[in-house]
Interface confidence: low
Amino acid sequence: MMTGTIETTGNISAKKGGSVILQCHLSSTMAQVTQVNWEQHDHSLLAIRNAELGWHIYPAFKDRVAPGPGLGLTLQSLTMNDTGEYFCTYHTYPDGTYRGRIFLEVLESSVAEHSARFQIP
């Protein structure tokens, strides 16, 4: 039985040209995380964090994606095209797969606030 819950940074906004941290956290389960996949809104994989092998950043994103903190992902040099949904997929044993959703809005405005609160989607 899957008892865990994915908490995410929820809906966040950030300035064009700036950086943002995408963070998911798996709680309420003793399951061991074997791999975390990070996907963009078009379902293209940004990065993978394998518990044994470490990080793999996909070549198309190498210049703008930094691993961490933790199992999270840092997007840099944001463009308006980065606006959209991001998904973290936690592969665990013995529970199976958990998935979290984050919506990122990239704003032109210099007063854009980066909300770092955690919420359960």
């Epitope: 518990a51 044994e52 470490g54 793999h56 013995p94 797969t97």
Partner: antibody
Framework: QVQLVQSGAEVKKPGASVKVSCKAS????????IGWVRQAPGQGLEWMGW????????NYAQKLQGRVTMTTDTSTSTAYMELRSLRSDDTAVYYC??????????????????WGQGTMVTVSS | DIQMTQSPSSLSASVGDRVTITCRAS??????LNWYQQKPGKAPKLLIY???SLQSGVPSRFSGSGSGTDFTLTISSLQPEDFATYYC????????FGGGTKVEIK
């Protein structure tokens, strides 16, 4: 075809070190970790650890920690296992094996699908 | 570390017999369980991975089942070339092997 070819048999004295090589061919070396397994005469299989050929990450069995070092040379598609401070109970056949774990499988398959022919290491005074 | 207990440690059987070997994990390992066959002087050979998936090229008389803590390797009709030692191995880090089951000719 896909294969792993290991270096030849070794005879070592207690306290010495041994380095076993494992040359891969027939597949993309950096796509899979290499695991090392040993088997003492007449005994079962013992997992020693593995190394990611992709980024050099290692994971060693706790009982060998501090005595074992696993490395790879991606230019020659070769993995190495060095065991130091040898004791008589290290006498065994040492196998390298391709570990099916990979970034592109969410599951930790961790099955060894291709094995080297084995290297006999004898530790004797 | 997760301990793997295999039983029996040895068994005698005849060609054509149905043979069952069991493997028990000290804690749940989901389906992260593999089976190998080893003949004297040879490297082990992967038979079954992920508890029940048959490795390419392995005869269909071999099958695996189970999940959680209890697993089974079945040889539906033992052939002369099947007399060997069989090992289970769990792949939750760190990997560990069972003690082996020697299948001998009755």
């Amino acid at each position: 075809q896909v294969q792993l070819v290991q270096s030849g048999a070794e005879v070592k004295k207690p306290g010495a070190s041994v380095k076993v090589s494992c040359k891969a061919s027939g597949y993309t070396f950096t796509s899979y970790p290499i695991g090392w397994v040993r088997q003492a005469p007449g005994q079962g299989l013992e997992w020693m650890g593995w190394i990611s050929s992709y980024n050099g990450n290692t994971n060693y069995a706790q009982k060998l920690q501090g005595r074992v070092t696993m490395t790879t040379d991606t230019s020659t598609s070769t993995a190495y296992m060095e065991l130091r401070s040898l004791r008589s109970d290290d006498t065994a056949v040492y196998y390298c094996a391709r570990d099916l774990s990979s970034f592109w499988s969410g599951d930790v398959l961790g099955a060894f699908d291709i094995w080297g022919q084995g290297t006999m290491v004898t530790v004797s005074s | 570390d997760i301990q793997m207990t295999q039983s029996p440690s040895s068994l005698s059987a005849s060609v054509g017999d149905r043979v069952t070997i069991t493997c028990r994990a000290s804690q749940s390992i989901s389906s992260y369980l593999n089976w190998y066959q080893q003949k004297p002087g040879k490297a082990p050979k992967l038979l079954i991975y992920a508890a029940s998936s048959l490795q390419s090229g392995v005869p269909s008389r071999f099958s695996g089942s189970g999940s959680g803590t209890d697993f089974t390797l079945t040889i539906s009709s033992l052939q002369p070339e099947d007399f060997a030692t069989y090992y289970c191995q769990q792949s939750v880090p760190p990997r560990t092997f069972g003690g082996g089951t020697k299948v001998e000719i009755k």
